[in-house]
């Protein structure tokens, strides 16, 4: 039975040219996390963290994505095209797969606030 829940940073906004932390947290389960996938709104994979081998950043994002903090992901040099949904997928044993959603809005305005509250989707 899957007892866990994914908490995410929910809906966040950040300035064009700036950076943002995408963060998910799996709680309420003792399941072992074997892999975490980070996926963009167009279903392209940004990065994967394998529990044994570590981070793989997909070549297309190598210059703009930094691993961490933790199992999260830092997206840098933001453009307006980065606006959209991001998904974290936790592969766990024995529970199976948990998925969280984050919506990122990239703003032109210099007064854009970067909120980083945790929400349960």
């Amino acid at each position: 039975m899957m007892t866990g829940t994914i908490e995410t940073t929910g809906n966040i906004s950040a300035k064009k040219g700036g950076s943002v932390i995408l963060q998910c947290h799996l709680s309420s389960t003792m399941a072992q996390v074997t892999q975490v996938n980070w996926e963009q709104h167009d279903h392209s994979l940004l990065a994967i963290r394998n529990a044994e081998l570590g981070w793989h950043i997909y070549p297309a994002f190598k210059d703009r994505v930094a691993p961490g903090p933790g199992l999260g992901l830092t997206l840098q040099s933001l453009t307006m095209n980065d606006t959209g949904e991001y998904f974290c997928t936790y592969h766990t044993y024995p529970d199976g797969t948990y998925r969280g959603r984050i919506f990122l809005e990239v703003l032109e305005s210099s007064v854009a606030e970067h909120s980083a509250r945790f929400q349960i989707p």
Epitope: L45, I48, L53, G54, H56, I57, P67
Partner: antibody, heavy 128, light 108 residues
Framework: EVQLVESGGGLVQPGGSLRLSCAAS????????MDWVRQAPGKGLEWVGR??????????EYAASVKGRFTISRDDSKNSLYLQMNSLKTEDTAVYYC???????????????????WGQGTTVTVSS | EIVLTQSPGTLSLSPGERATLSCRAS???????LAWYQQKPGQAPRLLIY???SRATGIPDRFSGSGSGTDFTLTISRLEPEDFAVYYC?????????FGGGTKVEIK
Amino acid sequence: EVQLVESGGGLVQPGGSLRLSCAASGFTFSDHYMDWVRQAPGKGLEWVGRTRNKANSYTTEYAASVKGRFTISRDDSKNSLYLQMNSLKTEDTAVYYCARGQYYYGSSSRGYYYMDVWGQGTTVTVSS
Amino acid sequence: EIVLTQSPGTLSLSPGERATLSCRASQSVSSSYLAWYQQKPGQAPRLLIYGASSRATGIPDRFSGSGSGTDFTLTISRLEPEDFAVYYCQQAVPSPLTFGGGTKVEIK
């Protein structure tokens, strides 16, 4: 041309130390995991350890047989990999190879790890 | 750690014959982390197969790999004189990375 060249092998007494080097060329060294593998005379291959890439903060991992005695390090500015071997034992006698680790995922999030480029090896003999 | 057992230890065959090499894992391993290497005397190992079935760059199509779970196979469809060597399987996940003991393919 993608190439790995080991150096630093030699004869050392039990309890002694030795530092092996591996010079890499022809590829972006900082992007890659790097492994050390050894082969005792007339025996099979044995994995010694690895250093991960820059994205993984160059973290290291070791085989149980060498943990606490061997240290793997790298200098990306020199495209070089190192293996510091301390408290050497006669059973450490072997040819030591450095190898490039290919760690990646395909579009289907299927992961791979293998060693696709190997050096020619350097011989370490531990004997009194 | 996962123990890889290769069989047979030695395979005596003639050029032109088919070689079938086995690699058995002590517990299930992901096929994507299973590789095969060839080693000739006095030389470094050479990658043949990765992901259990994908040929490395420059490897002739007479070499093929298959298998999943605990049983993997390397097949050489028609042995060429340069194929007589020692072959090793290797797995990378779970850690630590381990090699099989090797199979020597020798001329009969």
